[in-house]
Amino acid sequence: FKVATPYSLYVCPEGQNVTLTCRLLGPVDKGHDVTFYKTWYRSSRGEVQTCSERRPIRNLTFQDLHLHHGGHQAANTSHDLAQRHGLESASDHHGNFSITMRNLTLLDSGLYCCLVVEIRHHHSEHRVHGAMELQVQTGKDAPSNCVVYPSSSQDSENITAA
């Protein structure tokens, strides 16, 4: 399986909420001996290997934000800790998983990584990740809503999210 990032760049004004999304593609084993570990973290810009460094999101580590479940099951993060930080990660049975960040500030700008680890009991792990950038813009001419840029587009194609 692979991880797809529908959008490579999210541009949002301060105070807005945003949902960053990844999608699991390809055949997903739904056997009883297979579980999926999905999580989110921040990483540094301009690394040779994107997403190799794992930094917390609003002081929450990738362990705090992880989802652990069987193939194509829905799941949500434990609400208390994450929601106190304005965060919620979720996964649906279509292979989409996301992190929602509320009340964005400039400090949320950066590179975000989703990580999926397929864990086969008594076998090796298979891990894949996706990367996307969030820019939280300030100033009177920042967009009024989030604007997302599809990963397939390198230039000015964009979509305004309500």
């Epitope: 587009s153 390198q154 000015s156 964009n158």
Partner: antibody, heavy 119, light 111 residues
Framework: QVQLVQSGAEVKKPGASVKVSCKAS????????MHWVRQAPGQGLEWMGR????????VYNQNFNDRVTMTRDTSTSTVYMELSSLRSEDTAVYYC????????????WGQGTTVTVSS | DVVMTQSPLSLPVTLGQPASISCRAS??????????MNWFQQRPGQSPRRLIY???NQGSGVPDRFSGSGSGTDFTLKISRVEAEDVGVYYC?????????FGQGTKLEIK
């Protein structure tokens, strides 16, 4: 990879205007602010202003407020900086630079455009 | 406007030796608990290049020998061991608020 390619050198007479272009590639053009910085011969760097290519919004350094105009053309991923009423002190290298909100800094710079103002 | 003052303006250094450049802002450049102080390198005949952003974060591709520190109004750029390719002018810049002002520049040369 991110590239900012600027237009070629210009020679202008005092009182004239100059329009410098900066063509961006390798990233979503409207997702990042673009700034302009100039450098007079043997001098330091001076911030002139910036444009948000998404909606054309601008902020100018008040030192240039009445003489500088920044525009963009999203169809060609190009930003422009026009400086009017040129004087000899405007002789400088003009740079465009992409701005990121992840750390608030100019992460990629154009190669520079030399503008010479001489009678 | 925030005035940025660098010292020294000229810095002769022996290859392999450390170097240090100071930058003082006329007012606090902190915002959201972060000092928005950046450092740029300009080699002879080239465009400026990002070195350090938000006080201490290295730009991509920047050698580990470059580091930044400080907070509030006083900041420092350090080069642990100067190499020949480090020759050029170094600028500090505050990005807390516009106009985004630069220091006068420090010219680093090899003794």
């Amino acid at each position: 990879q991110v590239q900012l390619v600027q237009s070629g050198a210009e020679v202008k007479k005092p009182g004239a205007s100059v329009k410098v272009s900066c063509k961006a590639s390798g990233y979503p053009f409207t997702g990042y602010f673009m700034h302009w910085v100039r450098q007079a011969p043997g001098q330091g760097l001076e911030w002139m202003g910036r444009i948000n290519p998404y909606n054309g919004g601008t902020v100018y350094n008040q030192n240039f407020n009445d003489r500088v105009t920044m525009t963009r053309d999203t169809s060609t991923s190009t930003v422009y900086m026009e400086l009017s009423s040129l004087r000899s002190e405007d002789t400088a290298v003009y740079y465009c630079a992409r701005w990121t909100f992840d750390g608030l800094f100019m992460d990629y710079w154009g190669q520079g455009t030399t503008v010479t103002v001489s009678s | 406007d925030v005035v940025m003052t660098q010292s020294p303006l000229s810095l002769p250094v022996t290859l392999g030796q450390p170097a240090s450049i100071s930058c003082r802002a006329s007012e606090n450049v902190d915002k959201y608990g972060i000092s928005f102080m950046n450092w740029f390198q300009q080699r002879p005949g080239q465009s400026p290049r990002r070195l350090i952003y938000a006080t201490s974060n290295q730009g991509s591709g920047v050698p580990d020998r470059f580091s930044g520190s400080g907070s509030g109004t006083d900041f420092t750029l350090k080069i642990s061991r100067v190499e020949a390719e480090d020759v050029g002018v170094y600028y500090c810049q505050q990005s807390k608020e516009d106009p985004y002002t630069f220091g006068q520049g420090t010219k680093l040369e090899i003794k």
